[in-house]
Interface confidence: low
């Protein structure tokens, strides 16, 4: 299937002024009822599904303001074991918590230069960025 | 902080030739290992990540040709509840599995209207599109 | 395949201390729920406690000032002491271990094959 | 503490017919959170340690043959053996973990008519 090239503007429309960073209210790109608190290797009962999850995450901000999204959230696992639905604290060995990794597709804003290499305002480079997403817990890999 | 307005080219540069699907080739943004055959209620021993898991899922092609990416792709849970990790087999209820959701950035391909309202090309407007990522094992949540 | 297998002397005085212990072999002391049960000959079963998270303990109420449920992560060891016997405790007692980590601590589904304990002079 | 009580307290079945063991706590031990209730069913052979068959009052532990199932909820519980085989003659203990003490029914016997 077809792929799309980068996007630049020229001196036409939109103006390059326009590529500044304008203000139009965007909800922010972070995970629902994002808590950097109280995270610890534990289920909870209650919160959000990374901390009530037997694999619990916590999230981390990348924030580059030149790339669009400008803040993506990396999931840093808490435990390295799954842990007991029964308590939500203790761990079995036998489950391990993994990442859940996704290549997404962002765009960094680039100078972008016209025929004669002059400066035409910015470009939008897609490119994939590896993240994160959250941790699973997963029956360890036999080998055979 | 702040955020990028809707990116459209003019007559100018790019050329509305090039907006048109091209055929740079870009690594599909399909999840590692896909597989959408042998999924069931059960935790493989082997395999990709969303088949290791305790809280199994497949994925669902969601393809759209006017969107960047074109290709998302939703995750689907297999079972209601979390996976045994002794037998991988059968459920325990006291586990949910739920899917994790995610607000992503995509793009639409939009005509663009010039000052006199006349086609200027393509447009790529900025939308939030839900997604699932994930099937997670999480405890219930318990009702105060 | 994990293994329990209880030991301890097989005849106690009357007033003394009943020790046993229950050693695990072929998987984690860790991560689980650790039962004793006891059944008198001829008769049914009786939950006597269980330790989880390596201190957390529950005890039978009818037992509960005598008894003491401990594990030593170390040597793979649960331990069961039992003070003041009297010819009640004469029975066989038994080491479980929870199912699977994500069952309920209740349900026992690894069993030892239990060692008989008299209470006599 | 949950008193269980068991009915019968022995029964004899043709092999090839259906047994029925019920068991009743002197409490509720269905969580209706997570709509479970806190009841396993245990087998014992002479000589031999129990095994559990089933737990959630209807989840049949791994390796236990179909034949074995278990139904109910609340405070009346069943054990049905569907074809009883000459293997299954033992004492069948039901037991709550709904609350500490957790509490054993005092026994069926299950023998060949």
């Known amino acids: 299937y077809s792929h799309w090239p980068s996007c630049c503007p020229s001196k036409g429309y939109p103006s390059e002024e326009l590529l500044r960073w304008s203000t139009v209210p965007v909800p922010p790109l972070k995970p629902a009822s994002l808590d950097f608190h109280s995270v610890s290797c534990r289920a909870s009962e209650d919160g959000p599904l990374n901390s009530r999850a037997i694999s619990p995450w916590r999230y981390e901000l990348d924030r580059d303001l030149n790339r669009l999204p400008q803040d993506l959230y990396h999931a840093r696992c808490l435990c390295p074991h799954c842990v007991s639905l029964q308590t939500g604290s203790h761990m079995d060995p036998r489950g391990n918590s993994e990442l859940l990794y996704h290549n997404q597709t962002v765009f960094y804003r680039r100078p972008c230069h016209g025929k004669k290499g002059n400066h035409k305002g910015y470009c939008l480079e897609r490119r994939l960025y590896r993240v994160s997403l959250a941790c699973v817990c997963v029956r360890p890999r036999v080998m055979g | 902080y702040s955020h990028w307005p809707s990116c459209c080219p003019s007559k100018g540069y790019p050329s509305e030739e090039l907006l048109r699907w091209s055929t740079v080739p870009v690594p599909p943004l399909k999840p590692a290992s896909l597989d959408f055959h042998s999924v069931s209620c059960r935790a493989s021993e082997d395999g990709p990540l969303n088949s290791r898991a305790i809280s199994p899922w497949r994925y669902e092609l969601d393809r759209d040709l006017n969107r960047l990416p074109q290709d998302l792709y939703h995750a689907r849970c297999l079972c209601p509840h979390c996976v045994s990790l002794q037998t991988g087999s059968h459920m325990d209820p006291r586990g949910n599995s739920e899917l994790l959701y995610h607000n992503q950035t995509v793009f639409y391909r939009r005509p663009c209207h010039g000052k006199k309202g006349n086609h200027k090309g393509y447009c790529l407007e900025r939308r939030l599109y839900r997604v699932s990522l994930a099937c997670v094992c999480v405890r219930p949540r318990v009702m105060g | 395949q994990v293994q329990l297998q209880e030991s301890g002397p097989g005849l106690v005085k009357p007033s003394e201390t009943l020790s046993l212990t229950c050693t695990v072999s072929g998987g984690s002391i860790n991560s689980y729920s650790w039962t004793w049960i006891r059944q008198p000959p001829g008769k049914g079963l009786e939950w006597i406690g269980n330790i989880y998270n390596s201190e957390n303990t529950n005890y039978n109420p009818s037992l509960k000032s005598r008894v003491t449920i401990s594990v030593d992560t170390s040597k793979s060891q649960v331990s069961l002491k039992l003070n003041s016997v009297t010819a009640a405790d004469t029975a066989v007692y038994y080491c479980a271990r929870t199912y699977n980590w994500n069952y309920e601590i209740g349900a026992m589904g690894v069993w030892g094959q239990g060692t008989t304990v008299t209470v006599s002079s | 503490d949950i008193v269980m009580t068991q009915f019968p307290d022995s029964l004899a079945v043709s092999l090839g017919e259906r047994a029925t063991i019920n068991c009743k706590s002197s409490q509720n031990v269905l969580i209706t959170s997570n709509n479970k209730n806190y009841l396993a069913w245990y087998q014992q052979k002479p000589g031999q340690p129990p095994k559990l068959l089933i737990y959630?009052?209807?989840t049949r532990e791994f390796g236990v043959p179909a034949r074995f199932s278990g139904s109910g909820s609340g405070t009346d519980f069943t054990l049905t053996i569907s074809s009883l085989q000459a293997e299954d003659v033992a004492v069948y203990y039901c037991q709550q973990y709904y609350s500490t003490p957790f509490t054993f029914g005092p026994g069926t016997k299950v023998d060949i008519k």
């Open positions: 959630w009052a209807s």
